[in-house]
């Protein structure tokens, strides 16, 4: 019998608002034996995988997918499912990646980890989560 | 189908100094974490060094018999992988596999080996 | 690091036998274990990793157990081509380690 997979969580470093030009990584995890994670931007399809999984706890597993340079068109929605054997789980809350201007100030404060703030998310809509895994030629369209 | 072909292995004397390849087909390179893995003539498996993708800023890892002697690298624009060898020792002969890794640190993908022979 | 100890080096068993070959960690991997097996001249093969999960093509006569610090391959029915060596492998922290091997050989 197939076992039911958690959700996967999904958060970002350093936060989720971004001065322009500086990077962000957004971190999945989900239970130990994921083969791959998938990070998806507003909607199923544009997304990026990877299967470079690090051991994050005793009973999870996180991948991580860093921007280097954060752009106005990196703003929005995203959130994380991954893959393992034999099926893909639901869909993480979505996180909202906000991008503001370089010089900041007091009215757009950065949302550290940890922070009161917390990040913006709103409930996923799980109406269907059957995914094809890449390797079975879904088109991406990659987010960086 | 997953590829893995390594070249580069011969004879060398101790203290020289050798490159292993490592050419990646049939699945999307730069998405996997890759690994060296060595056997001696007769002997069990021992992890040498592994990098990581760019998401986690090309990380490398090594095995303390290695450790600033060998250099692992990557070159995701050709799908190749490295493995650099210095001042290498007779312990160091041994066959050398080029492992693309899973799960986090199961080695799921063997290429069929190059085989590195120190001596003088 | 992570001591990885096969307590059997070879077995010696006879077609159809139930095999059972054990691994021990130093200290807990948190079922952070793969299994795999080598022929004579081929490349070693995973067959289970994170302890229990059976690879793709694996026959299911194969399974694994266990968690902590210990952990078992177990094989129902040996086959004539199931003669090989069988290494465990920790993938919880690096640097990685491989238990000294399992050779099965046919009484």
């Known amino acids: 019998q197939e076992e039911d997979l958690p959700r996967p969580s999904i958060s970002a470093e350093p936060g989720t608002v971004i001065p322009l030009g500086s990077h962000v990584t957004f971190v999945c995890r989900g239970p130990v034996g994921v083969q791959t994670f998938r990070l998806e931007r507003d909607s199923r399809s544009t997304y990026n995988d990877t299967e470079d999984v690090s051991q994050a706890s005793p009973s999870e597993s996180e991948a991580r997918f860093r921007i280097d340079s954060v752009r106005e068109g990196n703003a929005g929605l995203y959130r994380c499912i991954y893959y393992k054997p034999p099926k893909w789980s639901e869909q993480s809350d979505y996180l909202e990646l906000l991008v503001k201007e370089s010089s900041g100030g007091p009215d757009s404060p950065d949302t550290e980890p940890g922070s009161s703030a917390g990040p913006t998310q709103r409930p996923s809509d799980n109406s269907h989560n059957e995914h094809a895994p890449a390797s079975q030629g879904l088109k991406a369209e990659h987010l960086y | 189908e997953v590829q893995l072909v390594e070249t580069g292995g011969g004879l060398v004397q101790p203290k020289g100094s050798l490159k292993l390849s490592c050419a990646a087909s049939?699945?999307?390179?730069?998405?996997?974490?890759m690994n060296w893995v060595r056997q001696a003539p007769g002997k069990g498996l021992e992890w040498v060094a592994r990098?990581?993708?760019?998401?986690?800023?090309?990380?490398?890892y090594y095995a303390d018999s290695v450790k600033d002697r060998f250099t692992i690298s990557r070159d995701d624009s050709e799908s190749m992988l490295y493995l650099q060898m210095n001042n290498l020792k007779t312990e160091d002969t041994a066959m050398y596999y080029c492992?693309?890794?899973?799960?986090?640190?199961?080695?799921?993908?063997w290429g069929q080996g190059t085989s590195v022979t120190v001596s003088s | 690091d992570i001591q990885m100890t096969q307590s059997s080096s070879s077995f010696s068993v006879s077609l159809g036998d139930r095999v059972t070959i054990t691994c021990k960690a130093s200290?807990?991997?948190?079922?952070?274990l793969a299994w795999y097996q080598q022929k004579p001249g081929n490349v070693p093969r995973l067959l289970i990793s994170?302890?229990?999960s059976l690879e793709t093509g694996v026959p299911s006569r194969f399974s694994g157990s266990g968690s902590g610090k210990d952990y078992t391959l177990s094989l129902t029915s040996l086959q004539s081509e199931d003669v090989a060596t069988y290494y465990c492998q920790q993938y919880w922290t690096i640097p990685y380690t491989f238990g000294g091997g399992t050779k099965l050989e046919i009484k």
């Open positions: 990098i990581r993708t760019k998401n986690n800023n090309y990380a490398t």
């Open positions: 994170s302890a229990t």
């Open positions: 492992v693309r890794d899973r799960y986090g640190g199961a080695m799921a993908y």
């Open positions: 200290e807990d991997i948190y079922n952070r």
């Open positions: 049939g699945f999307t390179f730069n998405i996997n974490a």
